[in-house]
């Protein structure tokens, strides 16, 4: 029930990261006009990841594209990767962890490919998360660094009599967004990693130990006190389970307590 | 049709107040900022003050600041301006007028109110 | 605050013929999130209100004849009238209307030979 919990809500979690990461590279105030101690002007500017724009007075906004792509600064095309890298891997990581949900079955799927899918899934909620955190820092240091040399120019001019209007810019809500959801498919991640540990079938609780007696071997399971011999057919490892003993053929078989929520 | 009639304007001595009223007809006043703009009578144009629709900003030039308030009464189509310790120099022809929709422009203008300063 | 200077302060033209006048602002009125400049022409006649009549330094106004266009970019801007109408004797004023406080030029004033 706890996995199944733990994994649900990794699942969640993860999903709403994604969704925010998504918004987040898709908004346009990645940086937003500074207003403090800034020229007033007429026009509101703010930045995207795509394109850039300006409010005016009025409410009117409009937005010009980045049309060119090898103009633009490295730093900017490095977190567009970043942003895309951590979308595509989200995608995929949620579309795995659909069908290593416990509460959905499919077919006759074991509980170890389960447990394989979901730690995968986990693997990749971590890696697109802090690869959308990653991105959004970049960017924030970009803005800070853009910032103090904006403030050391402000007031300098361009050296002749004509000044050209230095507009600083601050972190935009873009920022926050995706700081948080990258934050939250991280914590997804490490949720699903940690409810693969739960539904992977261990091979034995307790280590055997065995004890050669004359003519044949007993390999004595303290706890769950079934003995199994060295011969014959039943040369199968056993699991112990809350519920008892059995067989993989019988973990297959027969749904355990843990099977439904 | 865009209409904006400028009133309260008149003789005032040097120091004194006055107040100048602008009502408003012909579009949604309260989705508009706002200008008040002078011209001094065989001279050019000074812009004075603007307030935006909600009233969240309002910027005055450095002629006037600190003596006229510009405010609006949305509810009532009106924008006024509070003109306080006049001088001789502020004697002019006062226009409200309309902040457009594209460009930041001044778009409509009204007729003027003159305010004369003098003793 | 921002100077807007115009040139010339007067000029006198015969109809029909091309005229242009030049308008200087001390910084730049580009906005780079848009590409636009923020610069606006406006006409006043003898005892009339100005009149809007070209915004994004380049726009018309809707309703203001073709024969009125605006050019430049940054820090200076042009106002042409390709054929002056009589009704065109005015003094045409260039506006800042990028940074606060809004500043006009002291305008130029067009008379008919």
């Known amino acids: 029930m706890a996995v199944t919990a733990c994994q649900g809500l990794g699942f969640v979690v993860s999903l709403i990261g994604i969704a925010g990461i998504i918004a987040a590279t898709c908004m346009d105030q990645w940086s937003t006009q500074d207003l403090y101690n800034n020229p007033v002007t007429a026009v509101f500017n703010y930045q995207g990841l795509w394109r850039s724009c300006v409010r005016e007075s009025s409410g009117f906004t409009e937005c010009r594209g980045y049309f060119t792509l090898l103009g633009l600064p490295a730093m900017l095309q490095a977190v567009r990767a970043l942003m895309i890298v951590g979308i595509v891997l989200g995608a995929i990581g949620l579309l795995v962890s659909i069908f290593a949900l416990k509460c959905i079955r499919i077919g006759s799927m074991e509980d170890s490919a389960k447990a394989n899918m979901t730690l995968t899934s986990g693997i990749m909620f971590i890696v697109s998360g802090l690869c959308a955190i990653a991105g959004v820092s970049v960017f924030a240091n970009m803005l800070v660094t853009n910032f103090w040399m904006s403030t050391a120019n402000m007031y300098t001019g361009m050296g002749g009599m004509v000044q050209t209007v230095q507009t600083r810019y601050t972190f935009g809500a873009a920022l926050f967004v995706g700081w948080v959801a990258g934050g939250l498919t991280l914590i997804g991640g490490v949720m699903m990693c940690i409810a693969c540990r739960g539904l992977a079938p261990e091979e034995t609780n307790y280590k055997a130990v065995s004890y050669h007696a004359s003519g044949h071997s007993v390999a004595y399971k303290p706890g769950g006190f079934k003995a199994s011999t060295g011969f014959g057919s039943n040369t199968k490892n056993k699991k112990i389970y809350d519920g008892g003993a059995r067989t993989e053929d019988e973990v297959q078989s027969y749904p355990s307590k843990h099977d439904y929520v | 049709e865009v209409q904006l009639v400028e009133s309260g304007g008149g003789l005032v001595q040097p120091g004194g107040s006055l107040r100048l009223s602008c009502a408003v007809s012909?579009?949604?006043?309260?989705?508009?900022?706002m200008h008040w703009v002078r011209q001094a009578p065989g001279k050019g144009l000074e812009w004075v003050a603007y307030i935006s629709s909600g009233t969240t900003n309002i910027y005055y030039a450095d002629s006037v600041k600190g003596r006229f308030t510009v405010s609006r009464d949305n509810a009532k189509n009106s924008l006024y301006l509070q003109m306080n310790s006049l001088r001789a120099e502020d004697t002019a022809v006062y226009y409200c007028?309309?902040?457009?929709?594209?460009?930041?422009?001044?778009?409509?203008w009204g007729q003027g109110t003159l305010v004369t300063v003098s003793s | 605050d921002i100077v807007m200077t115009q040139s010339p302060d007067s000029l006198a033209v015969s109809l029909g013929e091309r005229v242009t006048m030049n308008c200087k602002s001390s910084?730049?009125?580009?906005?780079?999130?848009?590409?636009?400049?923020?610069l606006t022409w406006y006409q006043q006649k003898p005892g009339q209100p100005p009149k809007l009549l070209i915004y994004?330094?380049?726009t018309r106004e809707s309703g203001v004849p073709d024969r009125f266009s605006g050019s430049g970019s940054g820090t200076d801007f042009t106002l042409t009238i390709s054929s002056v109408q009589a009704e065109d004797v005015a003094v045409y004023y260039c506006?800042?209307?990028?940074?606060?406080?809004?500043?006009f030029g002291q305008g130029t004033k067009l008379e008919i030979k």
């Open positions: 910084q730049s009125l580009f906005s780079s999130g848009n590409q636009r400049n923020y």
């Open positions: 012909g579009f949604t006043f309260s989705s508009f900022g």
């Open positions: 506006q800042n209307v990028y940074i606060y406080p809004l500043t």
């Open positions: 007028v309309r902040s457009g929709y594209y460009g930041s422009s001044l778009d409509y």
């Open positions: 994004w330094a380049s």
